[in-house]
Interface confidence: medium
């Protein structure tokens, strides 16, 4: 088996769609498999076409984390296997940009992770700096939610409420749809009262560089930068 076209590396923003191409040839026509960080690809769609002993495989991915993607072309002559490999890296640029961008729209929350936390028919802000805002924001919550499984029973419900209301911010509709941040007082209550130990551990890990990316920072608000409920009763959301 021989690879004619290797997949290309990409540097993309969180929530982007990327298609990796791998083309191979051989007699007989090889099969192509994709590996993600050493394991079989768990998500994404694969499309294949074969023409004139050439196989073309396209892997479409929704990017939520960096990764090494390997295309493996294999065919068999009698008892002998022939294998060719080619790899591409997907890295993520500007993790925190979407949070600074106020471009988006209001829509009812249709996800699952925050169903029990957000009000029924809650109007949330969906950020159009993501390719697919609903999917990207739901994945952000899902990723951070998994980390909450290890926190204390006192901290967990408060952290879940903070997380969901921070990533799926309440939305003020109108001419310029605007996300309504959590009130500073509620954020501080979670940080200093309900989750004081956990928050310290997380900040310590951040300073020591134990987090490989800034992704978790998207799901943890900086309390000091949030508006106070005493400034404008409608400018921030109460948990």
């Amino acid at each position: 088996a021989r690879i004619l076209r290797a997949p290309e590396s990409h540097n993309v923003t969180f929530g982007s769609f990327v298609t990796l191409h791998c083309t191979a040839t051989g007699i007989p026509v090889p099969t192509i498999t994709w590996i993600e960080n050493g394991n079989a690809v768990s998500s994404g769609s694969i499309q294949e076409s074969v023409k004139d002993r050439v196989i073309d495989s396209r892997l479409q991915l929704f990017i939520t984390k960096p990764g090494l993607y390997t295309c493996i072309a294999t065919n068999k002559h009698g008892e002998k296997f022939s294998t060719a490999k080619a790899a591409a890296t997907i890295s993520i640029a500007e993790w925190s940009k979407p949070q600074k961008d106020n471009k988006g729209y209001c829509a009812q929350y249709r996800g699952e992770v925050c169903n029990a936390v957000l009000a029924k028919d809650a109007l949330v802000f969906l950020n159009t700096s993501y390719a697919d805002p609903e999917e990207a924001q739901e994945l952000l919550v899902h990723t951070a939610w998994n980390e909450l499984k290890v926190v204390s029973p006192v901290c967990r419900p408060a952290a879940e409420a903070l997380l969901c209301n921070h990533i799926f911010q309440e939305c003020s509709p109108g001419v310029v749809p605007t996300p309504i941040p959590i009130c500073r007082e509620y954020c501080l209550a979670v940080k200093e009262l309900f989750c004081a130990k956990e928050w310290l551990v997380m900040e310590e890990k951040t300073h020591r560089g134990l987090y490989r990316s800034e992704m978790h920072l998207l799901s943890v608000p900086e309390c000091s930068k949030l508006p106070s409920m005493h400034w404008d009763p409608t400018a921030c959301a109460r948990l």
């Epitope: 509709p173 310029v176 404008d232």
Partner: antibody
Framework: QVQLQESGPGLVKPSQTLSLTCTVS??????????WSWIRQHPGKGLEWIGY???????YYNPSLKSRVTISEDTSKNQFSLKLSSVTAADTAVYYC???????????????WGQGTMVTVSS | EIVLTQSPGTLSLSPGERATLSCRAS???????LAWYQQKPGQAPRLLIY???SRATGIPDRFSGSGSGTDFTLTISRLEPEDFAAYHC?????????FGGGTKVEIK
């Protein structure tokens, strides 16, 4: 107490540009949070939102008028202005300037209005 | 755009009576972002209600707003002589901001 006063010609010829100014007294147009709007009312009819300018200088217009409308501000004179180009008889109306409320839920409702100025488009 | 239809066009009532004005939207108004204004002849509109049910500063409590989705109501519990005027609804839920055609409340 904030007050708004419209000024400008009461008669404009068809195809010309209608120009109106709103002078704000009792408060600064550049003070945070407010948006400054133009709304019109055709004789005996309902109200129509034309557009507004935010304290930050960003402008937002009604899509039906967007190609003909410009709203600008002169902070030194504490005024904001409306220009409506290529006018026709259908633009004959009372033109109001108004202030959008400061709070987030109030920015697209109008809590203070000028008394209005009648503009007739006729040759 | 959201089209607002007000009914009735004219309401003839006597002072002391209850007035019920309707405003129907062509599509759902998010978060009940609907406002009501009062307008007297030769004057500019005056904000009464925003967010469907919140009274603006200085508005007497005989004025109340209710409703959600596509159907909204302005109620004046006991009409005072100064309440005879035109009333406009406005949605502040999506762009462009739109107003209803108005309801005139006149003395019977």
């Amino acid at each position: 107490q904030v007050q708004l006063q419209e000024s400008g010609p009461g008669l404009v010829k068809p195809s010309q540009t209608l120009s109106l100014t709103c002078t704000v007294s009792g408060g600064s147009i550049s003070s945070g949070g407010y948006c400054w709007s133009w709304i019109r009312q055709h004789p005996g009819k309902g109200l129509e939102w034309i557009g507004y300018i935010y304290y930050s200088g960003s402008t937002y217009y009604n899509p039906s008028l967007k190609s003909r409308v410009t709203i600008s501000e002169d902070t030194s004179k504490n005024q904001f202005s409306l220009k409506l180009s290529s006018v026709t008889a259908a633009d004959t109306a009372v033109y109001y300037c108004a202030r959008g409320g400061r709070w987030l839920q109030l920015r697209d409702v109008f809590d203070i209005w000028g008394q209005g100025t009648m503009v007739t488009v006729s040759s | 755009e959201i089209v607002l239809t007000q009914s009735p066009g004219t309401l003839s009532l006597s002072p002391g009576e209850r007035a019920t004005l309707s405003c129907r939207a062509s599509q759902s108004v998010s978060s009940s972002y609907l406002a009501w204004y009062q307008q007297k002849p030769g004057q500019a509109p005056r904000l009464l209600i925003y967010g469907a049910s919140s009274r603006a500063t200085g508005i007497p409590d005989r004025f109340s707003g209710s409703g959600s989705g596509t159907d909204f109501t302005l109620t004046i519990s006991r009409l005072e002589p100064e309440d005879f005027a035109a009333y406009h609804c406005q949605q502040h839920s999506s762009s462009p901001l739109t107003f209803g055609g108005g309801t005139k409340v006149e003395i019977k």
